[in-house]
């Protein structure tokens, strides 16, 4: 079952997942000026059996250039500017989809890719925050949330999450503080840890993966 | 030229039920994604139910999952919502929104759909 809503917003942080659960659907998008081919796939799916989970479908996006690519015709209401969906995220590839059982990685990048991914998350997927560069994380429990069905409806839980304004930045559970941080690489947040099964290994993923996986757009 | 109109708003008591239209022209729903948004006076724009052409994602947000139910007519290149057991806070205009992707769902998602109706008001009186 699709969770209803988005993951909780959390002023000044961002999210990812580790891996995404079977059943997460990756919209097919496109970056300005291409559009996805007409017989294309709308979505990739994360499916699989108990052994081995992939992604479906394939994204493929074509130039629009003989196509009116300005297509608002009334104004939208109370215009906003377009805001990540869900957190881009990096084409590095650096965990066996395998160590998560019935969990896919992060989807390779696809030509002319959109720089937002927009996920649509299973029931029992776990997405994790982080401060957004300037920011420190204060911990008041575990800076993730978990989509839940309670009562037929959806819910995500709370991340215990704020984040202030110092030139300091969080980092996922189980990143190592660096020995120096030349380049002011994030401090490591190890308050953050819980004692779950899922999110054991999914620290175990993370701690294997650099910041960059928190790259909005590619290179 | 696009155009989505939407129809069917009106005045209800709480409990009450309308059925909302929006008629597109210039654009086939057959290859488009249609979702319904609202916005009560002084709050943001606010996501209600979305459905690719393919019928492979439906999503609601959840204030209104269990009561509103979205539907389409490609053929007649129509969209609806049916909204059952209305509440007061179910106040606002509604708009309908269409893209050529898929389903884009949540708090601020109104960025990516490329087409919009003008709204109509909905008023659920207690």
């Known amino acids: 079952e699709l969770c209803d809503d988005d993951p909780p917003e959390i002023p000044h942080a961002t999210f990812k997942a580790m891996a995404y659960k079977e059943g997460t659907m990756l919209n097919c998008e496109c970056k300005r000026g291409f559009r996805r081919i007409k017989s294309g796939s709308l979505y990739m799916l994360c499916t699989g059996n108990s052994s081995h989970s992939s992604w479906d479908n394939q994204c493929q996006c074509t130039s629009s250039a003989t196509r009116n690519t300005t297509k608002q015709v009334t104004p939208q209401p109370e215009e906003q500017k377009e805001r990540k969906t869900t957190e881009m995220q990096s084409p590095m590839q650096p965990v066996d989809q395998a160590s998560l059982p019935g969990h896919c990685r992060e989807p390779p990048p696809w030509e002319n890719e959109a720089t937002e991914r927009i996920y649509h998350f299973v029931v029992g997927q776990m997405v994790y925050y982080q401060c957004v560069q300037g920011y420190r994380a204060l911990h008041r429990g575990p800076a993730e949330s978990v989509c839940k069905m309670t009562h037929g409806k959806t819910r995500w839980t709370q991340p215990q999450l704020i984040c202030t304004g110092e030139m300091e930045t969080s980092q996922f559970p189980g990143e190592e503080k660096p020995q120096a941080s030349p380049e002011g690489r994030p401090e490591s947040e190890t308050s953050c840890l819980v004692t779950t099964t899922d999110f054991q290994i999914q620290t175990e993923m993370a701690a294997t993966m650099e910041t960059s996986i928190f790259t909005t757009e590619y290179q | 030229q696009v155009q989505l109109v939407e129809s069917g708003g009106g005045l209800v008591e709480t409990g009450g039920s309308l059925r909302l239209s929006c008629a597109a022209s210039?654009?086939?729903?057959?290859?488009?994604?249609m979702a319904w948004f609202r916005q009560a006076p002084g709050k943001e724009r606010e996501f209600v139910a979305a459905?690719?052409?393919?019928?492979?994602?439906?999503r609601y947000a959840s204030s209104v999952k269990g009561r509103f139910t979205i539907s389409r007519d490609n053929a007649g290149n129509t969209g609806f919502l049916q909204m059952n057991s209305l509440r007061p806070e179910d106040t606002a205009v509604y708009y309908c929104?269409?893209?050529?992707?898929?389903?884009?769902?949540?708090?601020?998602?109104?960025?990516?759909?490329?087409?919009w109706g003008q709204g109509t008001q909905v008023t659920v009186s207690s």
């Open positions: 210039g654009i086939t729903f057959n290859d488009h994604t």
């Open positions: 929104a269409a893209r050529e992707g898929g389903v884009v769902a949540g708090v601020r998602s109104g960025a990516p759909y490329d087409y």
């Open positions: 459905r690719d052409w393919s019928d492979i994602i439906t």
